[in-house]
């Protein structure tokens, strides 16, 4: 709606951002799909969850994800401008006690079972993008977004604000 916000370039950036409250400001149960309307699905395999990006058959039920919204301070940059703005961060949980995590070493997105308080790897800055899409930026690795690669979710580095419109980091949220 506002257009694309751009890529965070501060070196300390989101690492230093603080979640204002321990409890979420609101929660939202939604299905997650790609810009090209492929569904994000979750399957239990060998006692662990796998994440897939796939075309669903007609009338096939979409998996739902619980988005928990948190208000967060956006830190001043290293030049010390002294201004802390506000951001919206989310955690994503497709099933009880499991959350999407950013594995920055492997550039992968994984489902981990964990207890609260959740680690920083489970938090993503939610970006309000054009064309009724959103994107998810890693709290632990600014400029790195959840994206689609080879029919899986992966972490994708976005090196300039012009590249934020890249379709593979755009997602749609729907109640249906």
């Amino acid at each position: 709606a506002f257009g694309i916000s751009g890529v965070q370039k501060y070196t300390r950036a989101l690492h230093d951002s603080s979640i204002t409250g321990i409890s979420p400001i609101t929660e939202y149960l939604a299905s997650l799909s790609t810009y090209n309307d492929q569904s994000i699905t979750f399957a239990l395999e060998d006692e662990s969850y796998e994440i897939y990006v796939e075309d669903l058959k007609k009338d096939e039920k979409k998996d739902k994800v619980l988005l928990s919204y948190y208000e967060s301070q956006h830190p001043s940059n290293e030049s010390g401008d002294g201004v802390d703005g506000k951001m919206l961060m989310v955690t994503l949980s497709p099933t009880k006690d499991f959350w999407l995590h950013a594995n920055n070493k492997e550039h992968s997105v994984e489902l981990h079972k964990c207890e609260k308080p959740l680690p920083d790897q489970a938090f993503f800055v939610l970006h309000n993008m054009h064309s009724n899409c959103v994107s998810f930026e890693c709290k632990t690795d600014p400029g790195v977004f959840i994206g689609v690669k080879d029919n899986h979710l992966a972490l994708i580095k976005v090196d300039s604000s012009e590249n934020l419109c890249t379709e593979n980091i755009l997602f749609k949220l729907s109640e249906t």
């Epitope: 709606a1 257009g3 694309i4 751009g6 956006h74 940059n77 919206l88 309000n128 934020l164």
Partner: antibody
């Protein structure tokens, strides 16, 4: 300190043109969506136009479409509003405003520059 | 477009009193489970200042006496105990969709 400083306002005749500028400082300009919002004397606020951080997307209120053009130069940390075919009803204080990081609401505002369209 | 209607147009109160301002939208401003309704304060000769975003969350540096509530189409800004510096005009604004629209404003004046 985060700052937005508008300039370029003034008196112009109906049908004339004006170019407003907004100089940004204290933050990574290219990382944020920025907009113009105007306020006619003694009246309410009206959103005019928005441009994305990467210059990819622009949006306008219907009343200025085809007459106004929003643009930005990220290398100069500057936002622009080119206003053509100006009308009396465009008379207002024009504010430059920056969205929050993540692009959900207007977070930072400049002091505004007055545009008067009159013969 | 989404039309926002604020009431009352003017609120005459004394310092220390509670102020309750209303904003009604012509359609829901909910998106992605968020109520995309924001509140701004404006004093004469100054730009607007963000008070509340997403219906109920205070902007940076906003005192705790300001609070927002509501969902869907009906929203309220409450100032629990008016300070002298709170006498100003207050605008609601929706960021759900283009064109972004503002309410016509509520003036809070000293009684």
């Amino acid at each position: 300190e985060v700052q937005l400083v508008e300039s370029g306002g003034g008196l112009v005749q109906p049908g004339g043109s004006l170019r407003l500028s907004c100089a940004a400082s204290g933050f990574t300009f290219s990382s944020f969506s920025v907009s113009w919002v105007r306020q006619a004397p003694g009246k309410g606020l009206e959103w005019v136009a928005t441009i994305s951080g990467g210059k990819t997307f622009t949006d306008y209120v219907d009343s200025v479409k085809g007459r106004f053009t929003i643009s930005r130069d990220n290398s100069k940390n500057t936002l622009y509003l080119q206003m053509n075919s100006l009308r009396a009803e465009d008379t207002a204080v024009y504010y430059c405003t920056r969205a929050n990081y993540g692009n959900w609401f207007f977070e930072v505002w400049g002091q505004g520059t007055l545009v008067t369209v009159s013969s | 477009e989404i039309v926002l209607t604020q009431s009352p147009a003017t609120l005459s109160l004394s310092p220390g009193e509670r102020a309750t301002l209303s904003c009604r939208a012509s359609e829901s401003v909910a998106k992605y489970g968020l109520s995309l309704l924001n509140w701004f304060q404006q004093k004469p000769g100054q730009p607007p200042r963000l008070l509340i975003f997403a219906a109920s969350n205070r902007g940076s540096g906003v005192p705790a006496r300001f609070s927002g509530s509501g969902s869907g189409t009906d929203f309220t800004l409450t100032i629990s105990s008016l300070e002298p510096e709170d006498f100003a005009v207050y605008f609601c604004q929706q960021s759900k969709e283009v064109p972004f629209t503002f309410g016509q404003g509520t003036k809070v004046e000293i009684k």
